[in-house]
């Protein structure tokens, strides 16, 4: 049989951020290669990453076709140099991945504060609307395009001289907050999808502070 020195893949894990989606698995191959297949629950299997010695496969192109679908992948193991060999049951060894629904499970990438502008005692903070690899009509959609009002941002802001973090929330990419005149503030934002139960929050954006080049100050 061609399976004597072929082992099935294990620890199949989806790694996905802002819909960039990679399936990873173990073990590192010794005298074997892998092919990955992916399908929706009701769809046909599509093969990817043919006869690879990698232990990962980028499945982004497949999942972005419909991010609200639930996907299943499987990893086939073949003896190196003899990929026609099959197991004793007439099939190569394979292992199934957990199910994966991109819209519900992709991690939210670290957001970026695009700009902030102070006018008197108001500050407008704008979050960059990150581009994803999801396409519609040949155009790449932004995170806001994909998630709509399901996506909110939490702004943490604090006086440079203090530690307590005030919060504000928006379901757009802009905040308008009240600040004390003559005080410098720092900002950090976090993306949140409240309707989720897991992967609800992104990591925090890098901190941006007033008095640095990203912002603009206008005295009225």
């Amino acid at each position: 049989s061609g399976t004597t020195n072929t082992v099935a893949a294990y620890n199949l894990t989806w790694k996905s951020t802002n819909f960039k989606t990679i399936l990873e698995w173990e073990p590192k191959p010794v005298n074997q290669v892998y092919t990955v297949q992916i399908s929706t629950k009701s769809g046909d299997w599509k093969s990817k990453c043919f006869y690879t010695t990698d232990t990962e496969c980028d499945l982004t192109d497949e999942i972005v076709k419909d991010v609200k679908q639930t996907y299943l992948a499987r990893v086939f193991s073949y003896p190196a140099g003899n990929v026609e060999s099959t197991g004793s049951a007439g099939e190569p060894l394979y292992e199934n991945s957990p199910e994966f629904t991109p819209y519900l499970e992709t991690n939210l990438g670290q957001p970026t504060i695009q700009s902030f502008e102070q006018v008197g005692t108001k500050v407008n903070v704008t979050v960059e609307d990150e581009r994803t690899l999801v396409r519609r009509n040949n155009t790449f959609l932004s995170l806001r395009d994909v998630f709509g009002k399901d996506l909110i941002y939490t702004l943490y802001y604090w006086k440079s001289s203090s530690s307590g973090k005030k919060t504000a929330k928006t379901n757009t990419n802009e905040f308008l907050i009240d600040v004390d005149k003559g005080e410098n503030y720092c900002f950090s934002v976090q993306a949140v999808i409240p309707s989720r139960t897991v992967n609800r929050k992104s990591t925090d954006s890098p901190v941006e502070c007033m008095g640095q080049e990203k912002g603009e100050f206008r005295e009225i």
Partner: antibody, heavy 120, light 107 residues
């Protein structure tokens, strides 16, 4: 089932310290925010402070700033309220509550509360 | 800090009565107002969020509305289990603040 259980309350002398715990089950605290709210006997609700367990960010009411510290241990799925330099006016039932984190819903689940009495 | 002024502080009503409690914010809080019910010795329970949305599992006799910075909690037909204290809270800005509470008692 989402549940929050406070513990650690009791009688303490003025100037003393106490640490309250808020053990969460049915959800992971780092995905949400945890607030502490207190209620003096026969009085209304007073917000104490919050923590985002994902990053440790906190904010406190002026009445407790510098004396109280909120922390969280995500591995234990538990938030804490460390209370130092306690005063008679800190006597209250202390509740922890979960902040759902949306624009709309705020404190959707509350613990049963734990009584802190500051008296000599 | 934003003040939430709640009125009345207490009221007496009978089963079947329509009850209205109001809360006035000291500045604009958009719709970021919640209403809670608290019974003696128990934790508060969320009733209304975002000024007018009924929280899951809350009876439809409870409703909320907003007019500018004025917020209203209405119980259309008071039931025996509704005798409790009600609090409004704004969460538009940090720190979030509560109204002083309204105790609804049996007439």
């Amino acid at each position: 089932e989402v549940q929050l259980v406070e513990s650690g309350g009791g009688l303490v002398q003025p100037g003393g310290s106490l640490r309250l715990s808020c053990a969460a089950s049915g959800f992971t605290i780092h995905e949400y925010w945890i607030h502490w709210v207190r209620q003096a006997p026969g009085k209304g609700l007073e917000w104490v402070g919050y923590i985002d367990p994902a990053n440790g960010f906190t904010y406190y009411a002026d009445s407790v700033k510098g004396r109280f510290t909120i922390s969280a241990d995500t591995s234990k799925n538990t938030a804490y309220l460390q209370m130092n330099s306690l005063r008679a006016e800190d006597t209250a039932v202390y509740y922890c509550a979960r902040d759902y984190g949306s624009l709309q819903v705020f404190l959707d689940y509350w613990g049963q509360g734990t009584l802190v009495t500051v008296s000599s | 800090d934003i003040q939430m002024t709640q009125s009345p502080s207490s009221l007496s009503a009978s089963v079947g009565d329509r009850v209205t409690i109001t809360c006035r914010a000291s500045q604009d809080v958009n719709t970021a107002v919640a209403w809670y019910q608290q019974k003696p010795g128990k934790a508060p329970k969320l009733l209304i969020y975002s000024a007018s949305f009924l929280y899951s599992g809350v009876p439809s006799r409870f409703s909320g509305s907003r007019s500018g910075t004025d917020f209203t909690l209405t119980i259309s037909s008071l039931q025996p289990e509704d005798f409790a204290t009600y609090y409004c809270q704004q969460h538009y800005t940090t720190p979030p603040t509560f109204g002083q509470g309204t105790k609804v008692e049996i007439k």
